[in-house]
């Protein structure tokens, strides 16, 4: 008797490894014999598709070499014209040993930046990714994290992060290792020992000493009053990534000597500078009686701080006042090192206005000092912590040169704006007008120039001077 088809063995979920064989069985009872068709994700599987084998009158579907794209729902449909067609469905879950699809590569990175070593993986179940540094498992911390993607992210890269890394992808079916890659950490040139200033007699011999470090080891060049050193002998030695340079001079004139340490990072260079003044006891230029002259500021460092076309006082006790004063700002900044985002613009304004003082032209050009109240605002409000550190270092004799003493004013010795408002200069930046604020160009710091944050704008808050201020 005719009998409608009945599927006696419903399809089940099949787990299969990539490149293995997977078989679905769809046992059917019926009379006459049914026609059986197969679909994957509702798309008909063609009888002549060479990736499949259909046997036992269509009751067995075999995938000959499973690929990860074979994942999906497979259905068999049986129909013999008696009654309706019947269908059974089952899923194919493609299991896959871990595979590293994007392995890490060798990386050269500058200290302080962020490094990302890629490690993208495939596998089912999804592999977990861990990293090995040298021979030991890498521990995550606040700086070092394995991302969801498997990549290793290192914030604020340190010298000790350099080394050999490999990633490990693991699931229940196996483990895959990447090849070993190298993370090389490069470090900006930094001056460890700045040359010291000297006050000597005419015809003396002086040795200036400058020590620098960095990765790769920097080279040191010496500059005299803005030009390459024309005389004197230089001796250099390198040990443990530290370069030591000694410049021996025969002194016949005063000058500003700058040690410049430079190293290369790819196509870019980093430099660090430190300067020392050589002055000659009782030496003065006979043709100049006054201490300086007024001129428009033409430098770079204080461009963002000083008023456009500002008339500044250039001190002729230096052989090349513009170059010397510009370097003083650089050197002072190097000694301030990292300061807070509130302190930095205030300190910039103070340094620039103190070293390049406003100039009152006349028969005798006169520098106009900063008003005491503005100096105190920087010292006590905006840079309280930094100022304390600097004063402590001064008292303990930790500064190698005396140059910072020239660049940071002693507030108590400055005139008050309450005595004579025209006798001292105000710092417009302490009224915090955001629009004037720019980043200084890179300075003597071994780090690249950093972002200067927005400061309180004049529309939101204002600096003022306490009227009850009493002299100290």
């Amino acid at each position: 008797l005719p009998k409608a088809p009945v599927i006696t063995t419903p399809l089940e979920t099949v787990d299969a490894l990539v490149e293995e064989v997977a078989t679905f069985m769809c046992a059917v009872e019926s009379y006459p014999q049914p026609e059986i068709s197969w679909t994957r994700n509702k798309i008909l599987i063609k009888l002549f598709d060479t990736r499949y084998s259909i046997r036992e009158n269509g009751q067995l579907l075999t995938i000959l070499s499973v690929e990860d794209s074979d994942d999906g729902i497979y259905c068999c449909t049986a129909n013999n014209g008696v009654g309706g067609a019947v269908e059974s469905c089952g899923a194919l879950q493609v299991k896959m040993k871990p595979k590293i699809t994007r392995p890490p590569i060798n990386v050269k990175i500058i200290e302080g930046l962020k490094a990302v070593l890629p490690c993208t993986t495939m596998g089912n179940p999804k592999p977990s990714v861990s990293w090995i540094k040298g021979d030991s498992p890498l521990r995550e911390n606040s700086r070092i994290a394995v991302l969801e993607s498997g990549s290793l992210r290192i914030h604020n890269v340190q010298k000790e992060d350099a080394g050999q890394y490999r990633c490990v992808a693991k699931n229940s079916l196996g483990t895959a290792y990447s090849k070993v890659v190298k993370l090389e950490v490069e470090v900006f040139a930094r001056i460890l020992r700045a040359p010291e200033s000297h006050n000597v007699t005419f015809g003396s011999f002086v040795t200036l000493h400058c020590t620098a470090t960095g990765i790769p080891v920097p080279t040191i060049t010496w500059i005299e009053n803005g030009n390459a050193v024309s005389s004197g002998s230089i001796q250099e030695s390198v040990k443990d990534r530290v370069i030591d340079s000694r410049l021996q001079l025969f002194i016949t004139k005063p000058g500003l000597y700058t040690c410049i340490a430079t190293n290369k990072h790819g196509e870019k260079f980093s430099t660090a500078k430190a300067a020392a003044t050589i002055s000659i006891a009782e030496w003065s230029k006979p043709q100049k009686d006054n201490k300086g002259y007024c001129a428009q500021y033409r430098g770079e460092v204080c461009n963002a701080v000083l008023a456009k076309d500002a008339l500044v006082f250039l001190n002729t006790s230096y052989a090349d006042p513009e170059e010397a004063q510009e370097l003083l700002v650089h050197t002072a900044w190097n000694e301030l090192k990292v300061v807070s985002p509130v302190c930095r613009p205030a300190a910039e304004a103070l340094l620039c206005n103190h070293i390049f003082q406003e100039c009152s032209p006349g028969v005798v050009p006169t520098p106009i000092p900063i008003c005491r109240e503005y100096c105190l605002a920087v010292k006590e409000l905006f840079c309280a912590k930094e100022w304390l550190v600097m004063e402590e270092k001064t008292h303990r004799g930790l500064y190698r040169s005396e140059m910072h003493l020239l660049s940071v004013p002693e507030c108590s010795k400055l005139p008050s704006m309450h005595w004579d408002p025209t006798a001292c200069a105000r710092l417009p930046h302490l009224d915090y007008n955001k629009e004037n604020l720019k980043t200084f160009p890179p300075m003597t710091s071994s780090k690249p120039s950093v972002d200067i944050p927005n400061l309180p704008s004049s529309s939101s808050s204002s600096f003022s001077v306490s009227p009850t201020y009493s002299m100290t």
Epitope: N156, V342, K385
Partner: antibody, heavy 119, light 113 residues
Amino acid sequence: EVQLLESGGGLVQPGGSLRLSCAASGFTFNSSAMSWVRQAPGKGLEWVSVISGSGGSTYYADSVKGHFTISRDNSKNTLYLQMNSLRAEDTAVYYCAKKELGDWYFDLWGRGTLVTVSS
Amino acid sequence: DIVMTQSPDSLAVSLGERATINCKSSQSVLYSSNNKNYLAWYQQRPGQPPKLLIYWASTRESGVPDRFSGSGSGTDFTLTISSLQAEDVAIYYCQQYYSIPPTFGQGTKVEIK
């Protein structure tokens, strides 16, 4: 015990004046920058002013500039806020707070004093 | 000025459960020179003054229980109370001190469900 205690709040008519005091104890007052922070009823916190440890430098929020004056007497370990030309929007609890050295967060607060400006 | 925005405005959490408060700044408060986030969190219990809980975004003030923790960097920050206690019912404020004037979030009220 380290503490700050405000006083001087009260009801005042618009245009009137009031002087708040804050007595400090238990820490080195003359080396600490001090601030006033206010909180309008049911509202959030608003920073008002700061004064350096020596009293030589002050700084104000724009909303109070010109009609509030911050001062201190280090011999009495006391901080002051002179409030002139008061307006309804100055109604708030006024807290004095010690500023962390070099950073602008506040590690010690007084209990506050309520200033109500109303006719 | 930097604008600080907290979410949610209020939340109710069962005792012993985790409470999470978010704070977003209108510009980054991460200073690249020292890799520090200039952000603090305060707790203000009913009728009390604010109390400093966390500074530098994740450093607990001494005496603050370790169930309070801060995280985040740049513009997005989170204060987490890992297991809410009855005494944690309060309004919590974030504050940036990256630029002057220092500014606070509008506050998030934490209650017991």
